[in-house]
Amino acid sequence: QPNNSLMLQTSKENHALASSSLCMDEKQITQNYSKVLAEVNTSWPVKMATNAVLCCPPIALRNLIIITWEIILRGQPSCTKAYKKETNETKETNCTDERITWVSRPDQNSDLQIRTVAITHDGYYRCIMVTPDGNFHRGYHLQVLVTPEVTLFQNRNRTAVCKAVAGKPAAHISWIPEGDCATKQEYWSNGTVTVKSTCHWEVHNVSTVTCHVSHLTGNKSLYIELLPVPGAKKSAK
């Protein structure tokens, strides 16, 4: 539906259940350990409602003694998932989220998967691999991204309101043309932010205004034709 002067405009991106992974391919397993140690921690933005696969350092499984995944989520006790090669046993401590699992049997694949990432999966994930040559770590600061819902409407003559609702992180709103604007942010307990920009255009030759919302999950633009100034009947341009 095209944008217009009175109808509420909404936009919500639909995510097919995509998968994202930072795993190295098998060729990189042969790289030396110093390369692994240099890449201890990674910040990783992941879209909500996608699948994520987190990987351990690329060390051949035959060299392993123990693999441990340590998961620290906000407001929860630290969860550990461990696999001991010698006894072929797995152990979990304080792990309650059934969506966070080994990709397959840990003796075959040390990767961790999160099925249908949620806001609650924001946190720190660390794989610790104990080998005869020492311990090797790889950590992920997982940042869950939430696409904001975008709306644009007019509430007064030549004043428009653009909202980016419940985004994570906060979206940025800009306008074409620039107006006399005020922007407010509202923070929600789940970590999302609503950004509201209210603008007024005094210049009478401005016909249509465009709200542009920039966000890590993608950008969105909506436009709306401004209502006439009250009492204005005729003007030559």
Epitope: P2, N3, N4, S5, L6, M7, I176, P177, N205, V206, S207, T208, V209, T210, S221, L222, Y223, I224, E225, L227, P228, V229, P230, A232, K233, K234, S235, K237
Partner: antibody
């Protein structure tokens, strides 16, 4: 689905006036600006002006100021564009458009000839 | 008034080729625009709204990009039925203004 149905072709003599109509359906007529655009044979597109049916507010391009009159009949959801003092260079297809230019009528051919 | 400079004014391209048309707004003034296709005897047909939004039912070989004052319309792989004249329209300021058009013919 917005539909704009325009009146039929007209042949006029120089100095006469023509009134083209555009009947809208499929949306709230009084909530959307109605624009008028014309296209002379083999030429580009030219904006004439617009009218807001909810209030009757109008903007005309200065090129047409004094010769063009835009009106609406909200009871029939119809917009009108009248052009007076016609000359041969006003021979063109006249289009109405709404929804921020995303919905167009099929056009009305106005021929000005002596 | 905002002038829209559209280029090229005409081009002749082979089927399967990539076509790029540009529109630039005068005065360095940021605007928003639509892209239209017009075939002889027909009303302009909206292809791209708001600079980059592909309209329903329009083939995905058509795309629009750009922001501010510089905009690009692209046909990724030209088809015989794409022979037409293409126009940009800025709708941010009154008067609305069109580019002068690009006549696209098939070699």
């Amino acid at each position: 689905q917005v539909q704009l149905v325009q009146s039929g072709a007209e042949v006029k003599k120089p100095g006469a006036s023509v009134k083209v109509s555009c009947k809208a359906s499929g949306h709230t007529f009084t909530s959307y600006w109605m624009h008028w655009v014309r296209q002379a044979p083999g030429q580009g597109l030219e904006w004439i002006g617009n009218i807001y049916p909810g209030s009757g507010s109008i903007n005309y391009d200065e090129k047409f100021q004094g010769r063009v009159t835009m009106t609406v009949d909200t009871s029939t959801s119809t917009a009108y564009m009248e052009l007076s003092s016609l000359r041969s260079e006003d021979t063109a297809v006249y289009y109405c458009l709404t929804m921020t230019g995303t919905s167009w009528g099929r056009g009305t051919l106005v021929t000005v000839s002596s | 008034d905002i002038q829209m400079t559209q280029s090229p004014s005409s081009l002749s391209v082979s089927v399967g080729d990539r076509v790029t048309i540009t529109c630039q707004a005068s005065q360095g003034t940021p605007i928003n625009l639509h892209w239209f296709q017009q075939k002889p005897g027909k009303a302009p047909k909206l292809l791209i709204s708001g600079a980059s939004n592909l309209e329903d039912g329009v083939p995905s070989r058509f795309s629009g990009s750009g922001s501010g004052t510089e905009f690009t319309f692209t046909i990724s792989s030209l088809q015989p039925e794409d022979a037409a004249t293409y126009y940009c329209l800025q709708f941010t300021y009154i008067p609305w203004t069109f580019g002068q058009g690009t006549k696209l013919e098939i070699k």
